[in-house]
């Protein structure tokens, strides 16, 4: 077990803070909830603290919760490939470019680390080149979320990882908006981290609303499990 992994044996409170600017539309989001890495479970509620969110909530899911991939459940035989927990408590910087097909792009930078016993994800997001009447600024996405695989590989030069995946957002007319994600994680501290073999995270997310919440918000339940590395031959013959 890495030293960082010891911090994830129970339920951990999570705080998310985002400041965004998409095509000049500025906004802020606060999120809070908890994670339980034993089950790969995240429960979070997000509030747009500046009024109405200028982009659809589903376009921010990867920035919020795929930001705290330290809550992914890594099976016993894969624990030595869990970069995310090994970087804690000092944490990691997570940078992404997200290309929305035939539309604009988001660039995000986040610091994910423990502050006391709370896991905090502080994010800056800049979005450019979006069409005012497109799927994103035109709010044409359905309020739901598909399952995805998130592919991870070591980046030995930067002592971190590179991650890429393609998100499929459902559009109200029945078509799909693709969002290509290119991600890089580097540790904040200078302690040792686990550099993984290639593998993937399997994610399932459910979006809902709190019927009593008057502010623009999103409630998110997510399960994430690492996969893609088989047991070694010695395991098979036990």
């Amino acid at each position: 077990m890495s030293k960082g992994e010891e911090l994830f044996t129970g339920v951990v409170p999570i705080l998310v803070e985002l400041d965004g600017d998409v095509n000049g539309h500025k906004f802020s989001v606060s999120g809070e909830g908890e994670g339980d890495a034993t089950y790969g479970k995240l429960t979070l509620k997000f509030i747009c603290t500046t009024g109405k969110l200028p982009v659809p909530w589903p376009t921010l899911v990867t920035t919020f919760s795929y930001g705290v991939q330290c809550f992914s459940r890594y099976p016993d035989h894969m624990k030595q490939h869990d970069f995310f927990k090994s970087a804690m408590p000092e944490g990691y910087v997570q940078e992404r470019t997200i290309f929305f097909k035939d539309d604009g792009n988001y660039k995000t930078r986040a610091e994910v680390k423990f502050e006391g016993d709370t896991l905090v994800n502080r994010i800056e997001l800049k979005g450019i080149d979006f069409k005012e009447d497109g799927n994103i600024l035109g709010h044409k996405l359905e309020y739901n979320y598909n399952s995805h695989n998130v592919y991870i590989m070591a980046d030995k030069q930067k002592n971190g990882i590179k991650v890429n995946f393609k998100i499929r957002h459902n559009i109200e007319d029945g078509s799909v908006q693709l969002a290509d994600h290119y991600q890089q994680n580097t540790p904040i501290g200078d302690g040792p981290v686990l550099l993984p073999d290639n593998h993937y995270l399997s994610t399932q997310s459910a979006l809902s609303k709190d019927p009593n919440e008057k502010r623009d918000h999103m409630v998110l339940l997510e399960f994430v499990t690492a996969a893609g590395i088989t047991h070694g031959m010695d395991e098979l013959y036990k």
């Epitope: 339920v11 409170p13 999120g31 809070e32 908890e34 339980d36 429960t43 009593n212």
Partner: nanobody
Framework: QVQFVESGGGTVQDGDFLRLSCTAS????????AGWFRQPPGREREFVAA????????LYADSVKGQFTISRDNAKNAMYLQMNRLKPEDTAVYYC????????????????????WGQGTQVTVSS
């Protein structure tokens, strides 16, 4: 803004159990993290237990771990404290408290972090 009414207090014998209830009104309870504090006679108010808005995250004072259980039912706008194997040193006025869930993390034992308080319910444990 949320208001609270505590109930379930009373006088019991050493080793008995009680279940305290805290019922919220005025706002949706699921928008709040919540906790229990107590004030023994002649002493400062002290932290007992806290619970996150989902009910999944809990925190206990060392002195009550394994003895008390905090829970909540958001559908009923209620929070509970199950107190087992009560001892005379558990005698106190018990208060429920809450804090707005976004911007406050539930794992706090500091009374200053909780903005909303009930009037309290007396628990007396006689030997």
């Amino acid at each position: 803004q949320v208001q609270f009414v505590e109930s379930g207090g009373g006088t019991v014998q050493d080793g008995d159990f009680l279940r305290l209830s805290c019922t919220a009104s005025g706002d949706t309870f699921s928008n709040y993290h919540a906790g229990w504090f107590r004030q023994p006679p002649g002493r400062e108010r002290e932290f007992v237990a806290a619970i996150s808005w989902t009910g999944e995250g809990t925190l206990y004072a060392d002195s009550v771990k394994g003895q008390f259980t905090i829970s909540r039912d958001n559908a009923k706008n209620a929070m509970y404290l199950q107190m087992n194997r009560l001892k005379p040193e558990d005698t106190a006025v018990y208060y429920c408290a809450a804090a707005r869930s976004v911007g406050f993390t539930w794992r706090s034992s500091k009374s200053n972090d909780y903005a909303y308080w009930g009037q309290g319910t007396q628990v007396t444990v006689s030997s």
